[in-house]
Every structure is written in C-alpha cells, then in structure tokens.
C-alpha cells in the first residue's frame, strides 16, 4: 500500500484536461496556455474493509493544493465537490471517510472513478468543453467516464 | 433527531448464545459505522467490533474474534451482535455505538441505551 | 494488546479547570491515535465529546477540550459546571481496532 500521494495527470478520452476556476474543477481543450492540475492520488488504507472487485479505492486532491474531491447530496442526487482538506488526513482516518472515496477501475488505458458513498455514480465530464467534472450514473451517453492517467514522477 | 434503541436484557446460561439487536432512526446508517462496546460491572469501556451497514463488512477486537459475529439488516436500519459460547465474564452491558466523520473527524457521537446480558447457570 | 489507562476518580471546584487524561501501555499517544471521548453521566445516554484528539463534536461546549500532554491524550474542562459531574472514558485507535479506558470519575464539588 502506498503511504505517499501519487501525482498523477489526467484527460478524457477527448484530450481535455482538467483544470482549476473559480474553486470548481472544469475539462478544458489541452492548449499552450492550459495549466492542467496535478491530481494526487493514495489509496485507502482501509482496502480490506471495503467492496471487493470495484475498482482500488482511493482519495483524489489537487497537488499542493489542500483541496480533495468529494461526493455529497444537493437536495436528492449527489454532486461532485472540491472540499479543504489534506489528503493524508483521510488516508490516516481510524475507517474510510467514504464522501471522499473513488473507486478506481482500469481497462486498458481507460480509467473510471466510481464514487464509494453513492455507489454508481462516477466521475464525469459533458461531452462538450468548458464544462465542469460531475457525478453520473449515465455511462457513456452524454457525458464522458473514461479518463487517461499518466503518472507523474 | 438520531437515536439507538437496543433490545431488552438477556438472561443465558453458559455455552449459550445471545443475539443483541440495535435500531437506528434519524440518520441513514449506510452513512456511518456502528460499533459494539461492553461493561462487566465495574469495570471500564471495552471494544468489540462494528459493522459497515452499506458494505456489511466487519472489523473485531482479536479478543472477541470468532465469538462475535455483527450483522445488519439496511431495510430495518437494524444491526446486530451476537455472541456466543459465553461464559459467566460476560455478563455485562452491551452497547452499540455510532461513530460518524463529522468535520475532520470520526466521533462516537450517539450510543444506544444498552442491553444487561447476564450468563448464569 | 495496548492497555489505556485513566485516573480513576478527580474533583474540580465549580467554575475551576481540571485536566484528565488517558495513557497508553504502548508507549506515547499521538494524533495516529485519533483520542475520542465520551462523557457518561447518570441516567442518560453516553455522549461524544472529542474526537481525533481536538475536535469537539457538534454541540459541544466550548469549555471542553482535547489535546496532548506529555505523551497522553488529555481532556480539559474550563470553567467547570455542576452537570459535568459525570464518567469520562476515552479511547484510543491502534491501528486496527479501538481500546477504551477504564474510566474516570469527575465530582464537581
């Protein structure tokens, strides 16, 4: 298990990449002047007391940052949200802090990340650009689920 | 508001079982963890185990490991424990307990009102 | 098995500051331990009063709080009030499981 986050890049399948406006997490065009975050990514220590065949779970926050995605309910369906937070404070927690956990399932060089507290629903993109990330349960219709990781070293 | 209410007290005979029922309201507990605690007359706290009620995975103290079993019924929002082989250093309250991730941190912030098991023969 | 140890008994005058505390056989407590405690008194329910260390839960006086001192997890009650009169138990995260103390007797007299 690793005991330091992992930076990692990440883009959909479109060649958007992620980046940092107004507090909120958008996928923008790779340019020049993009400056893309960094994600950084540990897995929980708690694996063994979580579901089984799901994917790794882990905690995502932005490198340097003390910001850490989140999953929690506005009004009846859960939304994604960047939170103050140290990601090695969640990964030392006594259980998994489970609105900050993803599920993260590969397939070839395809990447998803399934939210841990609302089974489900994953991390997504709208087919358009400028658009902010957000939780889905519509795989592969309008919005975009699959994503590149490259690490970072 | 949130609250715990556990089944009535138990009388057993040692070798026996007891299975300790724990209802929850006011809160989803898919969203929290729920612990077991017990206390032998005069004596201190001491930690069984909990249950994670979304996933129904266990943890337990290793002194309890293999006497204890915990489990949960998400449609009834009940949890259960039950303990077994149990000899006369049993008798106690059991508890059980919520611990929730509030803020920055997990507190055992709710616990049931507890249920008196005594083992005599 | 660590053991977690607590004073048994402490009285604190009305308005005064008592600190108790909760020690660990297996050497100093640390914020890895993630300290909680929960405060018990006579017929009512138990209630938590701290966790991960120096966090007080919601709805928590201002005067209680948690800390470390000299290697132990402490509780510190400022100010103390006649219905603080109660069983103090702490409890302390190793690794995979949780162990409480025995307790501490808190007379407000």
């Known amino acids: 298990k690793s005991e330091m986050p992992q930076p990692v890049s990440i883009q959909d399948i479109n060649h958007r990449v992620w980046v940092l406006q107004d507090q909120i997490l958008i996928a923008v065009p790779r340019k020049d002047r993009v400056s893309p975050v960094t994600i950084s990514l540990i897995s929980c220590r708690h694996v063994e007391t979580l579901e089984k065949d799901r994917g790794n779970p882990i905690y995502l926050g932005l490198n340097g940052l003390n910001l850490c995605l989140m999953c929690a309910k506005a009004g009846d369906q859960p939304t994604l949200q960047l939170k103050e937070k140290d990601i090695m404070d969640l990964y030392n927690q006594p259980e998994p802090v489970k609105s900050f956990l993803f599920y993260h399932s590969q397939s070839g060089r395809n990447s998803t990340f399934e939210s841990v507290a609302f089974p489900g629903w994953f991390i997504a993109v709208s087919s358009e650009g400028g658009c902010p990330l957000i939780l889905t349960q519509e795989l592969g219709k309008a919005n975009t689920t699959d994503f590149g990781l490259t690490m970072l070293f | 508001q949130v609250q715990l209410v556990q089944s009535g007290a138990e009388v057993k005979k040692p070798g026996a079982s007891v299975k300790v029922s724990c209802k929850a309201s006011?809160?989803?507990?898919?969203?929290?963890?729920i612990h077991w605690v017990r206390q032998a007359p005069g004596q201190g706290l001491e930690w069984i185990g909990r249950?994670?009620?979304?996933?129904?995975?266990?943890r337990y103290d290793p002194k309890f490991q293999g006497r204890a079993t915990i489990t949960t019924d998400t449609s009834t929002s009940t949890v259960y424990l039950e303990f077994s082989s149990l000899r006369s250093e049993d008798t106690a309250v059991y508890y059980c307990a919520r611990l929730h991730y509030f803020g920055n941190n997990f507190f055992f912030d709710y616990w049931g009102q507890g249920t008196l098991v005594t083992v005599s023969s | 098995q660590a053991v977690v140890t607590q004073e048994p008994s402490l009285t604190v005058s009305p308005g005064g500051t008592v600190t108790l505390t909760c020690r660990s056989s297996s050497g100093a407590v640390t914020t890895s331990n993630y300290a909680n405690w929960v405060q018990e008194k006579p017929g009512q329910l138990f209630a938590g009063l701290i966790g991960g260390t120096n966090d007080r839960a919601p709805g928590v006086p201002a005067r209680f709080s948690g800390s470390l001192l000299g290697g132990k997890a402490a509780l510190t009650i400022s100010g103390a009030q006649p219905e603080d009169e109660a069983i103090y138990f702490c409890?302390?995260?190793?690794?995979?499981?949780?162990?409480f103390g025995g307790g501490t007797k808190l007379t407000v007299l």
């Open positions: 249950i994670d009620p979304a996933i129904g995975t266990t």
């Open positions: 409890a302390l995260w190793f690794s995979n499981h949780w162990v």
């Open positions: 006011g809160f989803n507990i898919k969203d929290t963890y």
